[in-house]
């Protein structure tokens, strides 16, 4: 709590401006008037202010608006919505998608804050949807943000943005949202020659089809162990042993670390050991020679 | 290209003047606060005096309080620290400084330029 | 407020990870900046507001921490890292600067 103490002469703000810029702490809470702050929130952003100057200018929002803040003076914020508590957050109605993108584009180059997950849950409960605008705002700023999207949230995520999405921003989803985002990178990157793409759409492979999984094997894309063992275990399954070394290229010699866990120990039980033992790895647990393989679930599916 | 070159640094005795100039290009001068920091030798950095960015206010640390000026002509795109009463423990690099438009930190720094205050 | 950092000196080799400590006399919320500064060139902004990576600073570089304790860590340490680190405060006037921590090699 700041002391109540008197503006001394001359030193009374008749505006917001940088002769503010120097004010003690006791001198801005007693010659900035909070009305006046309110109307001219714009200007702030143009004064380089300490974090306890801009804490006693909060303090006088505070007391003007103590049911929560105008969506007026939201948008013109700017750094001071760094001193923004969620409790804070809470208490605004935010409607606007330019204020949306003004808070955002403040807090630009930080990691995705409780503040900023609060005012996003305050606006999409706003706006009463979670429409394409929005999701394009918030994709463009936080790519992470597809995670924690639920899949039929995902499904209105619009192509061009995954663009933006970094390989790390995917290593929160789980293979549901792959399955919807992989069809839209690949939508998205379906221009670029084979080299490229494969660094473009290796991130959301852990929702691509036994068919892509097969064509890829085609364009000696030698993908990694760790791209490998994100893939879909139902999609790996059918994949040929040739294939598998296709696709992993040199890579392929990492298998044998790998033999006990998912998908790789999935796959060799369902390879006749005769061509595994072809990669020359050691990888035991496939089909004896000799043993008659019956899918049953084709069987199924002609019955 | 965004950019601050010092000069006028140079050896004085104790009790002389000097006057640093900080010729900025490459952004617009009259947006930015500006500050001084020097670095004695072999020491750390000591925040010296800032300005606003019409000029119109200033700062200094205490020890230098009454001893050095800072000014700015925003037409010439210049900052300029007057010292004078000079001491042997103002002996030190003196560097210009472009503040962040948001608060205080420094997001652009001149070379520096050597200031000696020796007899 | 007064900064104090640690190590004063450290010896690491290339590809170490490196953690520099800042510690402040009072809470300063995350009003915080460091440097990076090499032998007779001027400091360059690494990162600022305690967390936030400078634009063109490479991401080996992160800041951590809130109040009075701050970390700056380089994941892998490169041969261009070598150099004196300070860390600065914001919070309120007079700025101060840490006492610097400078990185050599082993």
């Known amino acids: 709590e700041v002391e109540k103490t008197a503006c001394p002469s001359g030193k009374k703000a008749r505006e917001i401006d940088e002769s503010l810029i120097f004010y003690k702490k006791w001198e801005l809470e007693a010659c900035v008037d909070a009305a006046l702050l309110a109307t001219q929130m714009d200007r702030v952003n143009a004064i380089p202010f300490t974090y306890e100057q801009l804490d006693v200018l909060k303090h006088k929002l505070d007391e003007l608006y103590p049911q929560g803040y105008p969506e007026s003076v939201i948008q013109h914020l700017g750094y001071l919505f760094l001193k923004m508590s969620p409790e804070d957050i809470r208490k605004w109605n935010v409607t606007s998608l330019e204020t949306l993108k003004a808070l955002l584009e403040v807090n630009k180059g930080h990691e995705m804050s409780p503040q900023v997950a609060t005012l996003i849950d305050r606006f999409v409960k706003g706006r009463g949807q979670l429409d394409k605008d929005t999701l394009d705002t918030l994709t463009a700023f936080y790519p992470g943000y597809l995670c924690s999207l639920s899949p039929e949230e995902l499904s209105s995520v619009p192509p061009s943005s995954i663009w933006a999405v970094r390989p790390q921003d995917l290593d929160t989803c789980d293979p549901r949202q792959l399955d919807v985002l992989y069809p839209k990178a690949r939508l998205a990157f379906q221009n670029m020659n084979g080299s490229e793409y494969f660094v473009k759409i290796q991130s959301f492979l852990g929702g691509a089809p036994t068919e892509d999984l097969k064509a890829l094997s085609q364009q000696n894309v030698s993908m990694d162990l760790a791209t490998f063992m994100k893939l879909r275990t139902d999609a790996v399954l059918p994949l040929t042993v040739a294939e598998v070394q296709k696709l992993l290229g040199p890579h392929v010699e990492g298998l044998k670390a790998e033999e006990r866990h998912r998908p790789v120990r999935d796959w060799i039980l369902r390879q006749r050991q005769d061509d595994l033992d072809t990669l020359g790895l050691g990888l035991q647990g496939g089909i004896p020679n000799g043993y008659l393989v019956l899918d049953l679930s084709m069987q199924e599916a002609l019955s | 290209e965004v950019q601050l070159l010092e000069s006028g640094g140079g050896l004085v005795q104790p009790g002389g003047s000097l006057r640093l100039s900080c010729a900025a290009s490459g952004f617009t001068f009259s947006s930015y606060a500006m500050s001084w920091v020097r670095q004695a030798p072999g020491k750390g950095l000591e925040w010296v005096s800032a300005?606003?960015?019409?000029?119109?206010?200033?700062y200094y640390a205490d020890s230098v309080k009454g001893r050095f000026t800072i000014s700015r002509d925003n037409s010439k795109n210049t900052l300029y620290l007057q010292m004078n009463s000079l001491r042997a423990e103002d002996t030190a690099v003196y560097y210009c400084?472009?503040?962040?438009?948001?608060?205080?930190?420094?997001?652009?720094w001149g070379r520096g330029t050597l200031v000696t205050v020796s007899s | 407020i007064q900064l104090t950092q640690s190590p004063s000196s450290l010896s690491a080799s290339v590809g170490d990870r490196v953690t520099i400590t800042c510690r402040a006399s009072q809470g300063i919320s995350s009003a915080l900046a460091w440097y990076q500064q090499k032998p007779g060139k001027a400091p360059k902004l690494l990162i600022y507001?305690?967390?936030s990576l400078e634009s063109g600073v490479p991401s080996r570089f992160s800041g951590s921490g809130s109040g009075t304790d701050f970390t700056l860590t380089i994941s892998s340490l490169q041969p261009e890292d070598f150099a004196t680190y300070y860390c600065q405060q914001f919070n309120n006037y007079p700025l101060t600067f840490g006492g610097g921590t400078k990185v050599e090699i082993k």
């Open positions: 507001d305690a967390s």
């Open positions: 300005i606003s960015g019409s000029g119109g206010s200033t």
């Open positions: 400084a472009r503040t962040s438009r948001t608060t205080w930190y420094f997001d652009l």
